[in-house]
């Protein structure tokens, strides 16, 4: 398991002893008395696995330490960075003849990743490593590690991998970190073209020609090319690309559209602000996402505002006539910002004992003019069962309702068929007319057929022709209709409701508001 350590972008690490959790487990020869794996603490008090040897007493030391197999990942030249601490022989009295202050670095190429033994003859020497700064007293105690860092390179390599080896010849040394890496020209973007990670060439003077590909949402103008140098730097850019959808050119780059902006097509245009009720959630949007509760229909253009389903229809009125029901309603207060509003009728048949247990009415029920896609605000439902509870739902729908169906878009009424509703009211009177109000009074129906629970007054401006009406309900046989417009003709209908349902509306009473209050007695006919 390795932890992440940050290195320059143009270096790819093949081995990092500091990133290994637990023992390194490299092979030492001899197995005992030579290199030894020891855990020390770094400046942050975290353990570091090191290899140490300090056989300074005897001459002719030949202690070898070999790494595990290191894959070369296609690299032809690799670099070895060694961080080590070397103890000054002067700090070890009486060992001047046998103590050394250098060690040797070797490598061996191999396709075999499981070689168990060190065969010294197979290894080629890279270099003798000496300390730039050896020391007499140790600096680990105050948590400041004074380390020597030496970097060597080797190549060209051709086999799948290689082993490194360290030969101690009698030094007092600790290998604190061994890192093996190769150099690459890192993925980069120049002139709107992206150039991939490219491993450097085999020798220190080679240039590798690389063809670039246009950045996302851009297209070629001239073929983009660059050269990867041996030090991992890109050289001599040629060619370029043009910005595409979701991006605009800024400072010579294709920059993603900012949040709240989008660009739908490949053009030279800048990014545009998202249409109403939409937003972009990330940079580089080619379209904008609708706000919560807002949607686009399939055939809506990306530049169109997002819309939402309509609110519920208003003022649902039912009229039961034996096994038929007439329903009327008003348009929703909110159409969701769309013109394509229509209505669907849902019929449910409910049990008398438990009204909550309802099921669909089935195909035997008929609707005039139709059940779904109604453009008018009324429907007649026939062929219902007698003595049965029905719940009718009127759903307002538009082009985006399917994306968010909700009970908030419907209004319902429950009726019982084949029960006697009250008869219609024969006489409605306007008791007082002012500029802004009309006081109405009426008589109880000739046939109440039960206890009258309430009266319902429907009224509308005469020239609206019942397209937009209002409803007032009252338990009394009179009411004041307020908030009217002066010098305007209104039509009033009244009906009674019992437990059996609503009766028919009365004949219309037409009243014109005026400028001077006067008492007018209506007889059910037109009054002015």
């Amino acid at each position: 398991v390795t932890g992440s350590r940050v290195y320059p972008a143009n270096e790819v690490t093949l081995l990092d002893s500091r990133s290994v959790q637990g023992e390194l487990g490299w092979i030492a020869s001899p197995l005992e008395g030579g290199w030894e794996e020891v855990s020390i603490m770094d400046e942050k008090n975290t353990p570091i696995r090191t290899y140490q040897v300090c056989n300074v007493m005897e001459a002719s030391q030949n202690n070898w330490l070999r790494t595990d197999w290191i894959t070369r990942e296609g690299a032809q030249r690799v670099y070895i960075e060694i961080k080590f601490t070397l103890r000054d022989c002067n700090s070890l009295p009486g060992v001047m003849g046998t103590c050394k202050e250098t060690f040797n670095l070797y490598y061996y190429e191999s396709d075999n990743d499981k070689e168990r033994f060190i065969r010294e003859s197979q290894f080629g020497k890279i270099d003798t490593i000496a300390a730039d700064e050896s020391f007499t007293q140790v600096d680990i105690g105050d948590r400041i590690m004074k380390l020597n860092t030496e970097i060597r390179d080797v190549g060209p390599l051709s086999k799948k991998g290689f082993y490194l080896a360290f030969q101690d010849v009698g030094a007092c040394i600790a290998l604190v970190s061994v890192r093996v890496f190769y150099k690459k020209c890192p993925l980069t973007v120049r002139n709107l073209a992206q150039f991939p990670d490219t491993i450097t060439g085999a020798d220190t003077s080679s240039l590798v020609e690389v063809r670039g590909s246009c950045v996302n949402n851009s297209e070629e103008k001239d073929v983009p090319k660059m050269y990867c140098g041996a030090d991992g730097e890109w050289l001599v850019p040629i060619g370029n690309c043009l910005c595409n959808a979701g991006h605009e050119e800024q400072n010579g780059e294709c920059q993603a559209c900012k949040i709240g902006y989008y660009k739908a097509l490949s053009t030279d245009a800048s990014c545009a602000k998202c249409p109403p009720h939409s937003y972009s959630v990330w940079e580089g949007a080619t379209s904008c996402t609708c706000d919560r509760g807002f949607f686009r229909a399939d055939n809506d253009a990306a530049s169109m505002p997002c819309t939402r389903p309509p609110s519920a229809p208003l003022n649902l009125i039912s009229n039961v006539n034996e096994t038929s029901v007439n329903l009327e309603w008003s348009s929703p207060q909110n159409t969701g910002g769309r013109q394509d509003i229509s209505y669907n009728v849902v019929c449910k048949k409910c049990g008398a004992g438990d009204p909550s247990k309802c099921r669909p009415c089935g195909s035997g029920v008929h609707y005039t003019p139709q059940q779904n896609g109604l453009k008018t605000t009324r429907v007649s439902i026939t062929d219902l069962l007698a003595h049965t509870n029905y719940t009718f739902e009127i759903w307002a729908v538009n082009g985006v309702s399917k994306y968010n169906p909700s009970p908030d878009q419907s209004v319902s009424v429950t009726v019982t068929t084949n029960q006697a509703a009250p008869s219609s009211i024969a006489l409605v009177q306007a008791k007082e007319v002012t500029r802004y109000s009309v006081a109405l009074a009426w008589l109880e129906p000739d046939r109440p057929n039960g206890v009258i629970l309430e009266y319902e007054v429907k009224y509308y401006e005469k020239d609206q022709n019942e397209r937009s009406y209002r409803i007032v309900r009252t338990a009394a046989r009179n009411t004041d209709i307020k908030g009217l417009n002066p010098l305007t003709s209104y039509v009033f209908h009244v009906r009674a409701r019992t437990a059996a349902g609503y009766g028919d509306f009365s004949e219309p009473l037409e009243v014109t508001t005026n400028t001077v209050p006067s008492r007018i007695i209506g007889d059910g006919a037109n009054s002015t």
């Epitope: 008395g33 140490q52 007493m57 001459a59 601490t85 103890r87 009486g94 600096d139 680990i140 105690g141």
Partner: antibody, heavy 121, light 106 residues
Framework: QVQLLQSGAEVKKPGASVKVPCKAS????????MSWVRQAPGQGLEWMGW????????TYAQGSTGRFVFSLDTSVSTAYLQISSLKAEDTAVYYC??????????????WGQGTLVTVSS | EIVLTQSPATLSVSPGERATLSCRAS??????PAWYQQKPGQAPRLLIY???TRATGIPDRFSASGSGTDFTLTISRVEPEDFAVYYC????????FGQGTKVEIK
Amino acid sequence: QVQLLQSGAEVKKPGASVKVPCKASGYTFTSRAMSWVRQAPGQGLEWMGWINTNTGNPTYAQGSTGRFVFSLDTSVSTAYLQISSLKAEDTAVYYCARVRFTVYGDGMDVWGQGTLVTVSS
Amino acid sequence: EIVLTQSPATLSVSPGERATLSCRASQSVSSNPAWYQQKPGQAPRLLIYGASTRATGIPDRFSASGSGTDFTLTISRVEPEDFAVYYCQQYGPSWTFGQGTKVEIK
């Protein structure tokens, strides 16, 4: 396994000499230095010095008198501590201990069981 | 010559408690001391040496830290077998021991 074997207790008269052997086994004798430490009764540890077992070169503690001599017989993997002109204050347990050199500092990682030298008239 | 002073002379702790032993050098040193444990009638045993490295077989409840002149040996949870005398030892051209700290049962 690695061990250091010391001789049994010695009782000496003042002015006499004593030679304390320390026989090593389980490792290459000449690869590690040997240190000598003494501990007077009820007292702490006192480092006396060490000897390079490869070259025979000794290093004595500061202030050490010439009465202490470290020597070797590598053919039998044995280090010796010789004390001459013994005094009553030389009464102590004498330990040999193998030295562990490392780049980050030194320690004595294997100890003999100690030899009690008693100087009494 | 560097003089090492250990404190306290005696430390009374109960098993399971944390024990902190101090070792102060008479002048600043750039290397951590070695630490030894000695039980009555036995030879000392190396606990910790260069760069706070535990010797072979020493449990990880023993740890050492410090810099300059002040160094510490910590026993995170004292076990019954840890009651003993502990010595710090400075290495260099001449080696010296501290006078020892006795860790006893409270």
